[in-house]
């Protein structure tokens, strides 16, 4: 039986999130380290089958850059209720049996019920904020001694640009059962029979504590004579770069199109191609 | 100063081939989302074909879907447009794009003088 914790994450995220944008976070334990402007990893999987795995490494944004800045502004989203109810039960039976001869018969049952209700919102990165933040800051000068390990061990290392949190603590109970029954009977000058029964019952309950990230949205950072983040993703797309050479740096003017609250920075690529 | 140069335009036969280049320079060449467009007499410019800033991801317009392959090499700082299998109705004026692939680079786009491609027998 799978992670209460899991499932739930992964019944908010399929509700909310159609265009498979969100992260999904894998332990409890780690949901508290996945906040706006936070630095992760992409750790590759060891299997085709399971996706990758993204790690904190307890690295803020600001911490990479100079002069100090303050703490990024995030905007908060609106609230969404979500309530998921499940109760299922399976059973059949089978008997066997020869005209006077053996019989077995034998039967079983599995049933499994959950139900959950938690307020989720959205904490996001205002583009706005990006720009301002990246044209006010530079990289810090020496990088920081973890962005040198991340480049020495070719990391791609991506920045939080949007939590799904919870609003307030939530418990979850999974309640999972099992029962079997079996007998026999054998015919003949000692007639043997036998009877068997059984049942399995287990409960998990979980406590998710208020502001527990559920699921999270990134962009690849891209650090060469600078910090800059990707807007769109690119699989072939590495963090840390050779600085170009003969080429200014590109600095941009004005302030970020604004897009509808909601919308991924990811999404505003059709607008740059068909302007 | 930013430049987008395209080259390789000429007359083909119909089913014939052709590689058109378009070489940047003055801007990190690597943090833009290059793309290829093209205008025929009396239409609206078309987009064509769309590569990510490293080359991982590429979109294409249905019409060229299976034809026409977009690939980059950034250590040259060039974007390319290999069209097969032309066909009339790709008579244009192909034109290169440069759209900032960051967000340093967001609010800049430039744009080549563009290269005549005509199919016709």
């Known amino acids: 039986m799978g992670s209460a914790f899991e499932r739930v994450v992964r019944r908010v995220v399929q509700e909310l999130d159609h265009g498979g944008e969100f992260i999904p976070v894998t332990s409890l334990q780690s949901s508290t380290g996945f906040q706006p402007y936070c630095l992760v990893v992409r750790k590759p999987s060891s299997s085709w089958f399971w996706k990758p795995r993204y790690k904190c490494v307890n690295l803020s944004i600001k911490d990479i850059l100079e002069p100090d800045a303050a703490e990024p502004d995030v905007q908060r989203g609106r609230s969404f209720h979500f309530y998921d109810a499940m109760d299922g039960q399976i059973q059949g039976s089978v008997e066997l049996a020869a005209p006077g001869q053996a019989k077995i018969a034998g039967g079983a049952a599995v049933s499994d019920s959950s139900s959950t209700s938690m307020n989720v919102y959205s904490l996001s990165v205002d583009p706005n904020t990006w720009q301002t933040l990246l044209h006010e800051a530079h990289l810090r000068q020496p990088e920081h001694a973890v962005l040198q390990q991340l480049a020495s061990a070719g990391d791609n290392v991506y920045v939080v640009t949007e939590v799904l949190q919870t609003q307030k603590e939530v418990e979850v109970t999974r309640t999972h059962k099992r029962e079997g029954s079996g007998r026999f009977s054998l015919p003949g000058a000692t007639c043997l029979q036998g009877e068997g029964q059984g049942h399995l019952s287990q409960k998990k309950t979980v406590t998710i504590p208020s502001g527990s990230t559920l699921a999270f949205r990134v962009a690849q950072l891209v650090i060469d004579s600078d910090l800059d983040v990707l807007l769109f993703p690119d699989k072939k797309q590495r963090t840390f770069q050779p600085p170009a050479t003969g080429h200014k740096r590109s600095t941009s003017e004005g302030a970020w199109p604004q897009l509808p609250s909601g919308l991924s920075m990811m999404r505003c690529l059709h607008n740059f191609l068909t302007d | 100063q930013v430049q987008l140069v395209e080259s390789g335009g000429a007359l083909v036969q119909p089913g014939g081939s052709l590689r058109l280049s378009c070489s940047a320079s003055?801007?990190?060449?690597?943090?833009?989302?290059m793309s290829w467009y093209r205008q025929a007499p009396g239409k609206e410019r078309e987009l064509v074909a769309t590569?990510?800033?490293?080359?991982?991801?590429?979109n294409y317009a249905d019409s060229v879907k299976g034809r026409f392959t977009i690939s980059r090499d950034n250590a040259k700082n060039t974007v390319y447009l290999q069209m097969n299998s032309l066909k009339p109705e790709d008579t244009a004026v192909y034109y290169c794009?440069?759209?900032?692939?960051?967000?340093?680079?967001?609010?800049?786009?430039?744009w080549g003088q563009g290269t005549q491609v005509t199919v016709s027998s």
């Open positions: 590569i990510t800033t490293a080359g991982g991801n590429t």
């Open positions: 003055g801007f990190t060449f690597s943090k833009y989302l």
């Open positions: 794009k440069a759209s900032g692939g960051t967000i340093r680079t967001v609010n800049e786009t430039y």
